[in-house]
């Protein structure tokens, strides 16, 4: 009986010789559980596992803890890969996180963190980031030290309010913090002075809601 080849991330797929960007099946570490992910095999050497993407507002990101845990949306369009998979993947290996951003004026920028991982569910998928470089701000728009993840039904922020309900979307809210890439999607010319938009403060400032975002990870030793 032939053993099925499994891949834990898009870097392994790339190294296996499959170098076309698209949807691939990944397998949870030490498990047979599978998840479908978009692999970007073109950006900066390829091998990137996309864990979040926004582009047109077609998917509702105001979701429950369970939905953010398991993932939602379509890897061909807007989606969230799933906190549980990302946590398991990044806890066993050193990963970098690249956040690619587009504004409504035709500019692009990125933030690259040289080490990224999520704690487990027992720690509310707390985000850990070090080593910021890139063009989307010299200061991290994800609050440091990392915050716990919050959703509309699981409030783990440091605010007297409930950030996820106020700003919409699940995110690593502080109180509430300089970013929220899972906020409400606003179209062009309606994307400024927004209290709950797609925000990356240290690139575009306050109240500016972005056109497109992609969060992607790759092993540091790729």
């Amino acid at each position: 009986k032939e053993e099925k080849t499994t891949f834990r991330d898009c870097a392994e797929i790339f190294k296996s010789g499959l170098t076309t960007s698209g949807i691939y099946t990944l397998t949870f570490p030490n498990s047979t559980e599978e998840v479908k992910a978009y692999c970007d095999m073109d950006m900066g050497g390829g091998g990137w596992t996309v864990i979040q993407h926004r582009e047109d507002g077609s998917v509702d990101f105001q979701r429950t803890w369970k939905e953010y845990k398991e993932g939602f949306g379509s890897p061909l369009g807007e989606y969230w890969l799933g906190n549980e998979f990302v946590s398991q993947l990044t806890s066993g290996h050193r990963y970098v996180l690249k956040i690619q951003l587009k504004d409504w004026e035709g500019s692009e920028a990125h933030s690259l963190y040289e080490h990224f991982y999520l704690s487990g569910e027992e720690s509310n998928y707390r985000i850990h980031l070090t080593g910021l470089t890139g063009t989307a701000g010299k200061i991290s728009s994800i609050s440091q030290p990392g915050s716990d993840f919050s959703t509309k039904d699981s409030d783990n922020d440091k605010c007297i309010c409930k950030c996820s309900q106020m700003l919409t979307g699940g995110w690593w809210f502080d109180a509430c913090g300089p970013s929220n890439l899972n906020g409400q999607y606003y179209p062009q010319k309606q994307n400024t002075n927004k209290f709950n938009g797609i925000k990356w403060y240290y690139w575009k400032g306050s109240g500016y809601s972005l056109k497109a975002t992609t969060m992607m990870i790759r092993p540091a030793d790729f």
């Epitope: 440091k158 605010c159 007297i160 309010c161 950030c163 106020m166 502080d174 109180a175 509430c176 913090g177 300089p178 002075n193 927004k194 209290f195 938009g197 925000k199 403060y201 306050s206 109240g207």
Partner: nanobody
Framework: DVQLVESGGGLVQPGGSLRLSCAAS????????IGWFRQAPGKEREGVSA????????YYADSVKGRFTISSDNSKNTVYLQMNSLRPEDTAVYYC??????????????????????WGQGTLVTVSS
């Protein structure tokens, strides 16, 4: 749509006074805090004063304490900044900005700059003889 419009800026001599207005639309002041900020040429934007209309709480930067007074008229959905004893170093573009009043860290009284998501276009204040 949320909109903030500042007015009242102008040229004033040192020691003089001005009253800036910030007219808000698209939301009610009851649920928001309004901050006044200023930016001088070549300098970072800095907080000057802020008010939470619901509780009447106010904040002032040390550099303007005793000289500036912030107030609000909720019936007009407008916040005012009365500036007395003006100095040349007060010369700047003055902006008002809004933040949902509840967006406060446990134990804190006021908001970091990045929490203010709605901004006006600014009004220029020049203090010169």
């Amino acid at each position: 749509d949320v909109q903030l419009v500042e007015s009242g800026g102008g040229l004033v001599q040192p020691g003089g006074s001005l009253r800036l207005s910030c007219a808000a639309s698209g939301f009610t002041l009851d649920d928001y805090a309004i901050g006044w900020f200023r930016q001088a040429p070549g300098k970072e934007r800095e907080g000057v004063s802020a008010i939470r209309s619901s509780g009447g709480s106010t904040y002032y930067a040390d550099s303007v304490k005793g000289r500036f007074t912030i107030s609000s008229d909720n019936s007009k959905n407008t916040v005012y900044l009365q500036m007395n004893s003006l100095r040349p170093e007060d010369t700047a573009v003055y902006y008002c900005a809004a933040v949902p009043a509840g967006r406060l860290r446990f134990g804190e009284q006021w908001y970091p700059l990045y929490e203010y998501d709605a901004w006006g276009q600014g009004t220029l204040v020049t203090v010169s003889s």
